[in-house]
Every structure is written in C-alpha cells, then in structure tokens.
C-alpha cells in the first residue's frame, strides 16, 4: 500500500509526542496553581487539537483559537504583567525569582504551548511530525504564530496598572515593530486599564554605560505609547546578573546603588 | 433524525424556582458544548448560559449570574437549567441549543418550552 | 444593550438582492453565525463560520465578514423569506451574543 501523499513544509514537524506533552504540562500546572484547579485538562486539549486538527495549516485564524482561550481564563493582578522582547530566557529567570509578576509563559496556555511546535493536515485527524509551515517560508496563518498572535493580543488586552516590558539592549532594534511585542501586544494595552508603560532595556556587555533609553527605537515606542495616551518610562539595567541577584536578596548592600 | 426536546416551562410566581429540561437524540451528546438561549415576548434572542461538552466549565450572561444554574447528564443525553430567584423580566421561551464545534454556531435549537413569571 | 448591531427592519421585493449587516467590535477575532427565525418558530442556522452554509440552506443565502463588520446576503428574495433574522458571535469575555434582530419584509 502506497504512503498518502502528505504535504511538504519548510519547517520542523510537530514535537513528538506532542498531546502528551500538552496533557501533562496542564496537569502540572493545575496542581501547582490553586485557582485554575477547577480546570478540566483533558477539554482544554479537545480545544486545543480543535484549533488546528483537520485544518489547512496555512489557513488557521484567531478565531479558532479562541475556545481555548476561553477554558484558559486567568486574571493578572494590575501591575504584575511582564512583557518581553527577544529576551524570554531573562524574563523567564526574573519571575520565578519575582512570583508575584507573570510573563504570558507563567499563564496556563502560554505554558502549555511554550518550545513546541503543532500542526496537523487539511481533512484527516492526523498530526504532522514530519513538518509544519515556517512563517517566512511558507505562511505567517499558521498554528503556531496564529496561537501566540492570539493569547499574546488575550493577554496585553486584559493588563492592567503599570505594565513592564524587558527588551533586549544588544540587539540592533533594541524595539522591534515587527516583533510581537511590537506588532501585538502595543497595540492591545487598553488605555483605560493602563496608566503605563515601564520599559527594561537589558545591557549586554559587560562595560556598556550608554543610556540606550535614548535609542532611536526606544523613542518610537515612547511615541507609540504616548500617541496611546499612556504614560511610558524607561530604565537601563547594565548588570542584567546583578539585577537578578537583588531580585533575590533586595536587602544587600551592593543593591542600594544601580544595577 | 437530530432532535432537541425542551419541558419544563411554566407559569411561576417571582422569586420562584424552575427546572427545565432538554433531550438530546440522534447526535452524541457528550461531544458537544450546549447553550440555552431565551427570547422575550417581542423581542430579540438572549444568550443566557452555555456548558462544555464534559459539564465541567460553565458560563453565563450577567442577568442570570448566581440565579441560574446550567448542567447537564451526558449518560442520559439531557440539559437542564435551574432557575432560581425568577423575575419578571425573566419572562421567555427558553431554548436550548447545540454549538458547533465550540463557536461555529448553533447548528440545533428545539422548539422552545414557554416560562412565565408573574403574580 | 447588545455588542452587535443590526437595523431593525430591511426590505425587497420578490427576486432582488437584500443585504443584512451586523457591526461589533468582536466581530473582528470571533466567528460569525446567521439565523433564521420564521414567524412562532425556533431559530434556523443559515450561516456558520463566518460564511459557511450548512447543507440544506439554498445558495441563495451568502455572507461575508471584514473587519468588525459582517453582512447576509439573499438573492432571489422569494416570500418564504420574510422572517427576522439575527447575528451571532462570541464577544469579548467569549461569551455568545445575539445582535438585536433585522425584521426583513417581502414587499
């Protein structure tokens, strides 16, 4: 019997074993989180596979995402959202030692989904593992980016009090307007909710002692925000190791000067 | 044949109690997230409560929060609403309905079974 | 106060074209769904998914969504056709709502 015919992407296939890793990863978290215990795991992945199983990978939208979305409901305290940009790893580290602030990765689906890659095949209930669309490749519709161009706008939308966002001071565009930060998560912070915006640029090297607050960039975020009608403010964090040490111990003495 | 039965509507006084019930053959019941949906006499369509296909997320239009209940009993393929606290305004036909898929549409809505609330 | 918004009544006489709109905010990242509600009966399912017609509803019924707006189209308008029909789509807690209704007559 002949293989069927399944279509060729540019991009790497959906993680093995994929809806255990989607199951357990809910679990865990329920467990952990006492508010979202009431969470059924098993309809979070029917939502989930529902999204994408049966579907032409190029053709996804928001609007299939947003069942899940809805089973994944949590609220954010006002200001304790953490954005990021180019810089998940740091951002990460920040709030397991910050428990009281949340990157979109600390959120139930934003947890799930983090590292891994889906797709399935247009009319069969089949996951593909051998490859999924790549955005530049092949087309920006697909599961993966439409899922995090979904809870990421979700997510921006429901903020509230003084968001912050850590942007990577290294990079050529310290603000990215194609990144998502810059392309989603701007343009959904709510005015009315949002007094403002606190902006993190993170320094690489070691003797860097440029206020990169005054980056071009950084200029056309404050603009955007500003033109949003919120406040935005900007710090420079030159010792991104040191920053994280005084996250943990705030009370040593070499934290009372800047970090 | 797909078919959805409701019963149970009746003439109550205000801050009465109702339940109506919902049968559900010729479809797999326990697969599908359900909605009840009212309609006031003359008026438009209101979504009241929706609930997911295992029973185990509910959700509710602000008028009825705390005073209805929505469940359902996928051994015996029925939807119920209890309905607690009525008001005259909660005065409808009560339908209930199959979603598609989640938030594709309502692809089935029973007849509608008639509730009264009045002294 | 409903989130989706639709003129009350429309009109057309038997064989024109008449178009029902449905304008909301929510409209933009949820689907959208068409229902028929003839005189003293249930609501029917005309439209799905934005713009898919389940089987068994004639080709005369089209519908098209842009942005935070969404529109029914009917073709060929027969006297069959006269009845209200609603919108729907979740809103912005992911919850269904209806719009107000549009009250089409067959002149």
């Known amino acids: 019997v002949l293989p069927r015919w399944r279509q060729q992407w540019s991009g790497s296939g959906t993680t093995s074993r994929f809806p255990e890793t989607v199951l357990a990863r809910c679990v865990k978290y329920t467990e952990v989180h006492p508010e979202m215990r009431h969470v059924d795991c098993q309809s979070v992945w029917d939502a989930f596979k529902g999204a994408f199983i049966s579907k032409y990978p190029c053709n996804i939208t928001e609007e299939d995402y947003q069942p899940l979305v809805k089973l994944g409901t949590q609220t954010v305290p006002c200001n304790k959202t953490l954005l990021w940009s180019r810089i998940k790893d740091l951002a990460h580290q920040f709030t397991q030692v910050q428990r009281d602030m949340f990157t979109l990765e600390d959120m139930l689906l934003g947890y799930l989904a983090d590292d891994l890659t889906w797709c399935g095949e247009f009319n069969t209930f089949e996951i593909n593992y051998q490859s999924c669309p790549d955005w530049r490749k092949d087309c920006s519709n697909n599961p993966v980016s439409v899922f995090w161009k979904t809870v990421s706008r979700r997510f921006a939308e429901t903020a509230c009090g003084v968001v912050h966002v850590m942007l990577n001071g290294s990079r050529s565009k310290i603000f990215d307007k194609n990144s998502t930060f810059g392309s989603v998560e701007v343009h959904n912070l709510q005015p009315e909710k949002v007094q403002a915006l606190e902006a993190w640029v993170i320094h690489g090297g070691r003797e860097d002692s440029r206020d990169l607050c005054q980056d071009p960039t950084i200029k056309e975020l404050e603009s955007i925000i500003s033109k949003r009608n919120i406040r935005f403010f900007c710090k420079n964090i030159y010792r991104p190791d040191k920053f994280l040490q005084c996250v943990k111990n705030p009370e040593d003495s070499s934290c009372l000067s800047g970090i | 044949e797909v078919q959805l039965l409701e019963s149970g509507g009746d003439l109550v006084q205000p801050g009465g109690s109702l339940r109506l019930s919902c049968g559900a053959s010729?479809?797999?019941?326990?697969?599908?997230?359900m909605s009840w949906v009212r309609q006031a006499p003359g008026k438009g369509l209101e979504w009241v409560a929706d609930?997911?296909?295992?029973?185990?997320?509910?959700w509710y239009a602000d008028s009825v929060k705390g005073r209805f209940t929505i469940s359902r009993d996928n051994s015996e393929n029925t939807l119920y609403l209890q309905m607690n606290s009525l008001r005259a305004e909660d005065t409808a036909v009560y339908y209930c309905?199959?979603?598609?898929?989640?938030?594709?549409?309502?692809?089935?809505w029973g007849h509608g079974t008639t509730v009264t609330v009045s002294s | 106060q409903s989130v989706l918004t639709q003129a009350p009544s429309a009109s057309g006489t038997p064989g024109q074209r008449v178009t029902i709109s449905c304008s909301g905010s929510?409209?933009?990242?949820?689907?959208v769904s068409w229902y028929q509600q003839l005189p003293g009966t249930a609501p029917k399912l005309l439209i799905y998914?934005?713009?898919e017609r389940p089987s068994g509803v004639p080709d005369r019924f089209s519908a098209s969504k842009s942005g935070t707006s969404a529109s029914l189209a009917i073709s060929g308008l027969q006297s069959e056709d006269e009845a209200d029909y609603y919108c729907a789509s979740w809103d912005d807690s992911l919850n269904w709502v209806f719009g107000g209704g549009t009250k089409l007559t067959v002149l």
């Open positions: 609930i997911s296909a295992r029973g185990s997320n509910t």
């Open positions: 309905a199959k979603n598609w898929n989640y938030n594709y549409g309502m692809d089935v």
């Open positions: 010729g479809f797999t019941f326990s697969d599908h997230y």
């Open positions: 929510s409209i933009q990242n949820n689907y």
């Open positions: 998914r934005n713009f």
